[in-house]
Amino acid sequence: AWELTILHTNDVHSRLEQTSEDSSKCVNASRCMGGVARLFTKVQQIRRAEPNVLLLDAGDQYQGTIWFTVYKGAEVAHFMNALRYDAMALGNHEFDNGVEGLIEPLLKEAKFPILSANIKAKGPLASQISGLYLPYKVLPVGDEVVGIVGYTSKETPFLSNPGTNLVFEDEITALQPEVDKLKTLNVNKIIALGHSGFEMDKLIAQKVRGVDVVVGGHSNTFLYTGNPPSKEVPAGKYPFIVTSDDGRKVPVVQAYAFGKYLGYLKIEFDERGNVISSHGNPILLNSSIPEDPSIKADINKWRIKLDNYST
């Protein structure tokens, strides 16, 4: 058996700094939560303790605070690179500043793959955006490989500003051939990472043959097993288990929003890539977890421009 730890965030919405418990501006620092400096502390702690770890984001890093207003996505690339994310799926809000506002600050600057299988570029945009985002990526993890296939809400044209040269296809229709392609490449452990909401996440788990795990976003769904640690009321257990049409138990996860929690899922695979077991819970990033001083110093450096903007 081979064990993989999936760390995941979604719908962070520009909460680079720590926030209050309700994800608004931090007032009393001793009771604040989240933020990339605190997230980094916890991620590094887990990376040090466990051998096979992936850090994934399921979209909507863009939009939500003055950080995005001022830095327009440059802050997302910078701090996700600093945390060494392994992959990200495109969310609808990544298109809020148009395709150019996605390409220049994020797609060209991210060191990690940015994914969506159901977004197809056409016309003059096709060559401009080619290779900057991918339908899937095969990631080496220790001596194994894991396939990550991305998806984005097909409602994005109605929710954001992707323009006329991007076609948002049905998620299940677009995902299946990409998963099939991964299978032909002998990739037998596949994560669907995307931003279409919990209902679609569950449908993907049910309908897309070959998907082993679904890591989602968009609906800000909070799942938890046991007594929840803060104010969020769980919509179900973590992971939420869907029985696929071909009889497999597929774990589906999401980690609320605003960087308040770090999703933590441990998956055990057999030698054929079948999920043997899955367990975990979102980790509440409260003040018991110190902010990493180095990332915090970087945040403070970037913060200066925001203070100038405010005044």
Partner: antibody, heavy 121, light 107 residues
Framework: QVQLVESGGGVVQPGRSLRLSCATS????????MHWVRQAPGKGLEWVAV????????YYPDSVKGRFTISRDNSKNTLYLQMNSLRAEDTAVYYC??????????????WGQGTMVTVSS | DIQMTQSPSSLSASVGDRVTITCRAS??????LAWYQQKPEKAPKSLIY???SLQSGVPSRFSGSGSGTDFTLTISSLQPEDFATYYC?????????FGGGTKVEIK
């Protein structure tokens, strides 16, 4: 167990070329970034080159850029360093070392025993 | 390029001593720092990665700490086999760079 074995070192005249090899075993070679690190006699360690796990990117310090080329053959589990326009200051023990499984810079968890390269007329 | 400055360049100590080696980066490198041990005529050996994580098989008397620009390698109780040269290395960004080394000698 995991092993890295360098070969190809020797004595070479300034301006000439040499190709080093690093044969690996005991791990999934195609999953790891691989590096060359050198050590001049009596001196410290100097990083020379990296090639990412899939060969997509290569990075070098200014001291060897344009003269040295790192490559890999994942089907043979072997790493190479082609050294051209060699200079006296390239004299060193050359180690191959295993890096990480991503595109981010990394440390080296496994080292070979090294191969000596002497550039002298 | 990020410069790594190690101090001291050499030190003399006795078996059982607590030994501390420091490494300073010319700019912030978060926790992307490793430590290596090298004995004469041998290849370096990885001791610590991510500033404080012990590499598998390394004795627990070795520990690392620090973040940003200042880092420390500590040997809590020096053993005969620990007499060697120690190097720090940053892997925050390319080009990867090493400290100049600290030679730990028998007093």
């Amino acid at each position: 167990q995991v092993q890295l074995v360098e070969s190809g070192g020797g004595v070479v005249q300034p301006g000439r070329s040499l190709r080093l090899s690093c044969a690996t075993s005991g791990f999934t070679f195609s999953n790891y970034g691989m590096h060359w690190v050198r050590q001049a006699p009596g001196k410290g360690l100097e990083w020379v080159a990296v090639i990412l796990y899939d060969g997509s990117n290569k990075y070098y310090p200014d001291s060897v850029k344009g003269r040295f080329t790192i490559s890999r053959d994942n089907s043979k589990n072997t790493l190479y360093l082609q050294m051209n326009s060699l200079r006296a200051e390239d004299t060193a023990v050359y180690y191959c070392a295993r890096g990480g499984s991503s595109w981010y810079p990394d440390s080296f968890d496994i080292w070979g025993q090294g191969t000596m390269v002497t550039v002298s007329s | 390029d990020i410069q790594m400055t190690q101090s001291p360049s050499s030190l003399s100590a006795s078996v059982g001593d607590r030994v501390t080696i420091t490494c300073r980066a010319s700019q912030g490198i978060s926790s992307w720092l490793a430590w290596y041990q090298q004995k004469p005529e041998k290849a370096p050996k990885s001791l610590i990665y991510a500033a404080s994580s012990l590499q598998s098989g390394v004795p627990s008397r070795f520990s690392g700490s620090g973040s940003g620009t200042d880092f420390t390698l500590t040997i809590s109780s020096l053993q005969p086999e620990d007499f060697a040269t120690y190097y720090c290395q940053q892997y925050n960004s390319y080009p990867l760079t090493f400290g100049g080394g600290t030679k730990v000698e028998i007093k």
